[in-house]
């Protein structure tokens, strides 16, 4: 978060930013930036694998929920969207695309139908769904 | 949008940002930044006047809907929240806190009950409600 001095190289002048204010990002153009994470909601319905590929093509991944505090904007998301959570049948656990295991108490997992993928819905709910079912999806990019 | 060179004054080094990426803001700390507007959703229920005062105290105003394209993140907002739209009984029009008139076709206006204030709900709907009814609210700050 850069809240001190910003160099506008075009005009070579300093822009003062109040210390209570800050820039967020960097994010892909026209993505949502919140607490230095980038999010985008995609309207077109794809299955989980196509959704994952779409996010990867944009240098991002499907939504990973890692913190109710840092991601409290997700509380108010309407509808159901693919996130990057998959079921590992061998050990019965749920894990994210990056291989990390779903932390307990982060999501309420609800079985919509038999499946190995999960949809995100408001108030930190995860709905189990068949991975080949088309749905809208959320991509996320964590800034460094 | 600053997507060229960013001066990190602390370390006095240039950080290269890909041209497809950009910073968003500046916004108050921990607000949502989207297309260079800042948004915050407040959980506590207040009447319209208290909600307006709360936003003003944060150098912001209640949500103003001015563009379906620039504010398409509002499509997916769950629940009902005060926005800065009020009914002017003298001429029957709906106007924003800044005095501008609601543009036609921006919001579908639905009467919940007799009232002079409006709640924002997903998919660009505005619900007419009594101004003294407590509700959650959305503050917005437009960046220059």
């Amino acid at each position: 978060i850069w809240s001190a001095v910003f160099l506008n190289s075009l005009f070579n002048q300093e822009v003062q930013i109040p210390l209570t204010e800050s820039y967020c990002g960097p994010c892909p153009k026209n993505w949502i930036c919140y607490k230095n994470n980038c999010y985008q909601f995609f309207d077109e319905s794809k299955n989980w694998y196509e959704s994952q590929a779409s996010c990867m093509s944009q240098n991002a991944s499907l939504l990973k929920v890692y913190s109710k505090e840092d991601q409290d904007l997700l509380k108010l998301v309407k509808s159901y969207h693919w996130m990057g959570l998959v079921h590992i049948p061998t050990n019965g656990s749920w894990q994210w695309e990056d291989g990390s295991i779903l932390s307990p108490n982060l999501l309420t997992i609800i079985e919509m139908q038999k499946g190995d993928c999960a949809l995100y819905a408001s108030s930190f709910k995860g709905y189990i769904e068949n991975c080949s079912t088309p749905n809208t999806y959320i991509c996320m990019q964590r800034t460094v | 949008i600053w997507s060229a060179v960013f001066l990190n004054s602390l370390f006095n080094q240039e950080v290269q940002i890909p041209l497809t990426e950009s910073y968003c803001g500046p916004c108050p700390k921990n607000w949502i930044c989207y297309k260079n507007n800042c948004y915050q959703f407040f959980d506590e229920s207040k009447n319209w006047y208290e909600s307006q005062a709360s936003c003003m105290s944060q150098n912001a105003s209640l949500l103003k809907v001015y563009s379906k394209e620039d504010q398409d993140l509002l499509k997916l907002v769950k629940s009902y929240h005060w926005m800065g739209l009020v009914h002017i009984p003298t001429n029957g029009s709906w106007q924003w806190e800044d005095g501008s008139i609601l543009s036609p076709n921006l919001l579908t206006i639905i009467e919940m009950q007799k009232g002079d204030c409006a709640l924002y709900a997903s998919s660009f709907k505005g619900y007419i409600e009594n101004c003294s009814t407590p509700n959650t609210y959305i503050c917005m700050q437009r960046t220059v």
């Epitope: - | 629940s79 009902y80 579908t108 639905i110 919940m112 009950q113 709900a121 619900y127 009814t133 509700n135």
Partner: antibody, heavy 124, light 108 residues
Framework: EVQLLESGGGLVQPGGSLRLSCTAS????????MSWVRQAPGKGLEWVSL????????YYADSVKGRFTNSRDDSRNTLYLQMNSLRAEDTAVYYC?????????????????WGQGTTVTVSS | DIQLTQSPSFLSAFVGDRVTITCRAS??????LAWYQQKPGKAPKLLVY???TLQSGVPSRFSGSGSGTEFTLTVSSLQPEDFATYYC??????????FGPGTKVDIK
């Protein structure tokens, strides 16, 4: 003028089917939830079913669940109640009503517009 | 399920009388209670919603009050056109509506 007009009532045998219609005018039909309420002869009001403004959610009284289907066609400003496996106890005047129930909202503002009712008689 | 009871089930009154009808819920229903008036052979008419808000066009002699489990509809000065049956209605369960059994108000 805000109006609701029901039709489709009549005499039907037990086990039979009937479809009621309710045509709306004078308000933005697609913006409101709609309910069906019935009243058996000489009895009080009984809520039957509600359909949300979008049509994506429908709710039913236990007494009709699995037998009645509430649907809407916003392009025709029309609400429907498909009634199957009818029983003698379904005999009633059926009213449709504009319902100020808003999904997920904390307050309920009642059924503010009612049709004149259509009579359904289930008898052999 | 939430049950509603109304008392009295029947009352006789003179024109000009102050009349109070009570509606009790079997459990708390916040302020989600409405009152309807129905005349013979006619559809019900919404009088009061959200416990105490008068529906547009309803005369001010009608008023509603209460909270939790006990609610009242009051007619401050009964008029000839007020002789009818009155029903309370709740929404608490999501969404399942219940009507009270009704109170018939007759001319004495």
């Amino acid at each position: 003028e805000v109006q609701l007009l029901e039709s489709g009532g009549g005499l039907v045998q037990p086990g039979g089917s009937l479809r009621l219609s309710c045509t709306a005018s004078g308000f933005t039909f697609s913006s409101y939830a709609m309910s069906w309420v019935r009243q058996a002869p000489g009895k009080g009001l009984e809520w039957v079913s509600l359909i949300s403004e979008s049509g994506s959610s429908t709710y039913y009284a236990d007494s009709v669940k699995g037998r009645f289907t509430n649907s809407r066609d916003d392009s025709r400003n029309t609400l429907y109640l498909q009634m199957n496996s009818l029983r003698a106890e379904d005999t009633a005047v059926y009213y449709c009503a504009k319902d100020r129930w808003f999904e997920g909202y904390h307050s309920y503002y009642g059924m503010d517009v009612w049709g004149q009712g259509t009579t359904v008689t289930v008898s052999s | 399920d939430i049950q509603l009871t109304q008392s009295p089930s029947f009352l006789s009154a003179f024109v000009g009388d102050r009349v109070t009808i009570t509606c009790r819920a079997s459990q708390g229903i916040s302020n989600n209670l409405a009152w309807y008036q129905q005349k013979p052979g006619k559809a019900p008419k919404l009088l009061v919603y959200a416990t105490s808000t008068l529906q547009s066009g309803v005369p001010s002699r009608f008023s509603g009050s209460g909270s939790g489990t006990e609610f009242t509809l009051t007619v401050s000065s009964l008029q000839p056109e007020d002789f009818a049956t009155y029903y309370c209605q709740q929404l608490k369960s999501y969404p399942s509506f219940t009507f009270g059994p009704g109170t018939k108000v007759d001319i004495k």
